[in-house]
Amino acid sequence: FRDCAEVFKSGHTTNGVYTLTLPNSTEEVKAYCDMEAGGGGWTIIQRREDGSVDFQRTWKEYKVGFGNPSGEYWLGNEFVSQLTNQQRYVLKIHLKDWEGNEAYSLYEHFYLSSEELNYRIHLKGLTGTAGKISSISQPGNDFSTKDADNDKCICKCSQMLTGGWWFDACGPSNLNGMYYPQRQNTNKFNGIKWYYWKGSGYSLKGTTMMIRPAGF
């Protein structure tokens, strides 16, 4: 199976961790599949929920992925780049705040450029409840990590804000920032940020980034 949509269509309709393999590749990755939300078939490419995993990682770690697919993890830029360049994918970002609210941003077309182009993010067609303007800057930026500064700032956004992300200068979002527990989650410049939902300084309780083929 190349993604969770294929897993779903094969008859496996239970949430859980599945092994995925890209066509013409022997390399396997373990990904969490959400088979319930919005019709199922979602491949989870990022999840934050409790601060149990350190997201201040190197370029190589963000490339290959890290964490626990059943909990907090990053699937890996290389796999996502290859997958999203084979067909059109949508990206859904699900967010939770500390007051019990949930929101989402859905992009009609999402893909990552290759590593040679620094896994630049490409997004089109925003809808959803987490802001009328995209909190991931458009046009998309290159990916940056603590050891690979590809942002548009004279500062080093990844070091300053922590975590790897498609930083602008530094931009209105960072879902891979520091995890702050409840009552410590406000006025944090380096937290888990989605500006056009919660504004400046608010660090979110939970985030999930998930992809699925368009027209699934």
């Epitope: 089109k124 067609g125 009328k132 998309g140």
Partner: antibody, heavy 115, light 107 residues
Framework: SEHLVESGGGLVKPGGSLRLSCATA???????MSWVRQAPGKGLEWVGS????????YLNTKFIGRFTISRDDSKNTLYLQMNSLRAEDTAVYYC?????????WGQGTLVTVSS | AIYMHQEPSSLSASVGDRVTITCHGS??????VAWYQQKPGKAPKLLIF???FKVYEVPSRFSGSGSHEDYTLTISSLQPEDFATYYC?????????FGHGTKVEIK
């Protein structure tokens, strides 16, 4: 913004026609787009908007029958066809991304209607 | 069409001053109001939307407030680069309509 670039403006006689173009970055493919105009020394006036696939069009009632909005997503281009032009249509015409409000604007193209 | 009555049409102020611009809609607008800044020869720039939500890159001295029919743009401490014309816009109803603008000039 280099992501929205208008062209096609110029001098036209009253009663004449003009087609304005707006070359858009491809990330606007799924977005509503609008035309907004501004007469010299005056305020902003919304002309109309068009949905991503061009299936929904909204035109300010004062332009119905004279102006038409269209788009060609294969060319990443937005158009404003203006017919029966009048002196009072003299303005800078901007294309903009329409989220209800306008968060991306082109640099504008000047249309002058004069005999 | 909804009429957006913007006041004042112009004002003179000094650097450091607090500036307030108001817009009154002819009908209930549900906070679907935006504010723009425009400098001569340039396209407008979005500052505020949904009545009070500041665009990320916009300095914190700009703020929006209001409800129902009445909305306000405030510049808490005017800076040299803030001298420009400001417009409100309602997007609750078609046709979208703008206020006539407020020109902020140097005193």
């Amino acid at each position: 913004s280099e992501h929205l670039v208008e062209s096609g403006g110029g001098l036209v006689k009253p009663g004449g026609s003009l087609r304005l173009s707006c070359a858009t970055a491809d990330f606007f493919e799924y977005d509503d787009m609008s035309w907004v105009r501004q007469a010299p020394g005056k305020g902003l006036e919304w002309v109309g908007s068009i949905s991503p696939k061009g299936d929904h069009k909204y035109l300010n009632t004062k332009f119905i029958g004279r102006f038409t909005i269209s788009r060609d997503d294969s060319k990443n281009t937005l158009y404003l066809q203006m017919n029966s032009l009048r002196a009072e249509d003299t303005a800078v015409y901007y294309c903009a991304r329409d989220v209800g409000f306008f968060d991306w604007w082109g640099q504008g193209t000047l249309v002058t209607v004069s005999s | 069409a909804i009429y957006m009555h913007q006041e004042p049409s112009s004002l003179s102020a000094s650097v450091g001053d607090r500036v307030t611009i108001t817009c009154h809609g002819s009908y209930w607008l549900n906070s679907e109001v935006a504010w723009y800044q425009q400098k001569p020869g340039k396209a407008p720039k979005l500052l505020i939307f949904d009545g009070d939500f500041k665009v990320y890159e916009v300095p914190s001295r700009f703020s929006g407030s209001g409800s129902h029919e009445d909305y306000t743009l405030t510049i808490s401490s005017l800076q040299p680069e803030d001298f420009a014309t400001y417009y409100c816009q309602q997007y609750r109803y078609h046709p979208y309509t703008f206020g006539h603008g407020t020109k902020v000039e140097i005193k």
